[in-house]
Interface confidence: low
């Protein structure tokens, strides 16, 4: 009696169970009563990542350098290529079809989290007691200089963009 279901890694065709092709190979011809399933390896630029009965392999993803992408992991006959962004760039969207430059934190803001290939720089305002006088994608807010520890006094108050200015103590008291 012909089978109605097949074992794992098999498929039903013409009332019989045929072996699926292993990852990295595509189907050339179904099995028959007398012959096994015929499979062929995917070509260099293609892959199949599951046990399958596909007659065509899938093309590897193209990491388009025009859009700031580079190959993070080269595809094999069983895996797709993984793209990432070039140094200094991060993915513009979840699907990562293009990359854009990391944002710099303006003076008065410091880097809370440095950008990665998939996320942009996160900036935060410098709180009281801290400052940033540069536009940077790496620099955190820096603490104001402590004049007291240098035996000096504050001559000019600091802001979120400028350090305090220290000066000598007034000796005429």
């Amino acid at each position: 009696e012909p089978p109605t279901a097949c074992r794992e890694k098999q498929y039903l065709i013409n009332s019989q169970c045929c072996s699926l092709c292993q990852p990295g190979q595509k189907l050339v011809s179904d099995c028959t009563e007398f012959t096994e399933t015929e499979c062929l390896p995917c070509s260099e630029s293609e892959f199949l990542d599951t046990w399958n009965r596909e007659t065509r392999c899938h093309q590897h993803k193209y990491c388009d350098p025009n859009l700031g992408l580079r190959v993070q992991q080269k595809g094999t006959s069983e895996t797709d290529t993984i793209c990432t962004c070039e140094e200094g760039l991060h993915c513009m969207s979840e699907s990562c079809e293009s990359c854009v430059p990391h944002r710099s934190c303006l003076p008065g803001f410091g880097v809370k989290q440095i950008a990665t290939g998939v996320s942009d720089t996160i900036c935060e305002p410098c709180p009281v007691g801290f400052f940033s006088n540069v536009s940077s994608a790496f620099e955190k807010c820096r603490p104001w200089t402590s004049c007291e520890t240098k035996d000096l006094v504050v001559q000019q108050a600091g802001t979120n963009k400028t350090d305090v200015v220290c000066g000598p103590q007034d000796r005429q008291r």
């Epitope: 065509r56 392999c57 899938h58 093309q59 993803k61 193209y62 388009d64 350098p65 025009n66 859009l67 700031g68 513009m92 969207s93 699907s95 079809e97 293009s98 854009v100």
Partner: antibody, heavy 120, light 107 residues
Framework: QVQLVQSGAEVKKPGASVKVSCKAS????????VNWVRQAPGQRLEWMGL????????SYNQKFKGRVTLTIDKSASTAYMELSSLRSEDTAVYYC?????????????WGQGTLVTVSS | EIVMTQSPATLSVSPGERATLSCKAS??????VAWYQQKPGQAPRLLIY???DRRTGIPARFSGSGSGTEFTLTISSLQSEDFAVYYC?????????FGQGTKVEIK
């Protein structure tokens, strides 16, 4: 909303070259990619290539085997497509289409099209 | 190159009816498919991108579905302004390729 305005219709002889311009209404083109697509009479749309104004990078449809050159003038927010060694089968409407950089191939905004007629 | 095949070539539908357009890719293009509408003498207009995302300003009667090699554009209730030619585009790999188009005409 980006608006793209293309140069006017052209009539060319076989073997000549044509250069079509595409001016964007945005101040800076660099948040967009610019694709060029053509459509011969009664035919499907055909992608010719793409230029990324951010870094000047280009990708071409190999069908055109070096006959197409895409360039950009960022200061004028204008993209150009030059097609050389024209033949009668190049008679078509040529479109520029730009896409936001987040989805660079979607071809969100289109020019009105430029008819190029190649005839001896 | 990846070949995109659309069916049917022509679809005759009455206003208010549902229209279902098919697009098949010759190999896996994941969800990297866009749909365009083109009227005579006009440039194409983007309707759907990434297989199912509707472009801002496109009416909700337009919807896209599918992944891999089979994609569908559905117009739930055809309006008079929807009679046009519809093209699918794959942007999984270069060269980007369009289908040959489906003409939606008044029955």
């Amino acid at each position: 909303q980006v608006q793209l305005v293309q140069s006017g219709a052209e009539v060319k002889k076989p073997g000549a070259s044509v250069k079509v311009s595409c001016k964007a209404s945005v101040y800076s083109f660099t948040g967009y990619t610019v694709n060029w697509v053509r459509q011969a009479p009664g035919q499907r749309l055909e992608w010719m290539g793409l230029i990324n104004p951010y870094n000047g990078g280009t990708s071409y449809n190999q069908k055109f085997k070096g006959r197409v050159t895409l360039t950009i003038d960022k200061s004028a927010s204008t993209a150009y497509m030059e097609l050389s060694s024209l033949r009668s089968e190049d008679t078509a409407v040529y479109y520029c289409a730009s896409s936001p950089y987040s989805n660079p191939y979607a071809m969100d905004y289109w020019g009105q099209g430029t008819l190029v007629t190649v005839s001896s | 190159e990846i070949v995109m095949t659309q069916s049917p070539a022509t679809l005759s539908v009455s206003p208010g009816e549902r229209a279902t357009l098919s697009c098949k890719a010759s190999q896996n293009v994941h969800t990297r498919v866009a749909w365009y509408q083109q009227k005579p003498g006009q440039a194409p207009r983007l309707l759907i991108y990434l297989a199912s995302d509707r472009r801002t300003g496109i009416p909700a009667r337009f919807s896209g579905s599918g992944s891999g090699t089979e994609f569908t554009l559905t117009i739930s209730s055809l309006q008079s302004e929807d009679f046009a030619v519809y093209y699918c585009l794959q942007h999984w790999t270069y060269p980007l390729t369009f289908g040959q188009g489906t003409k939606v005409e008044i029955k």
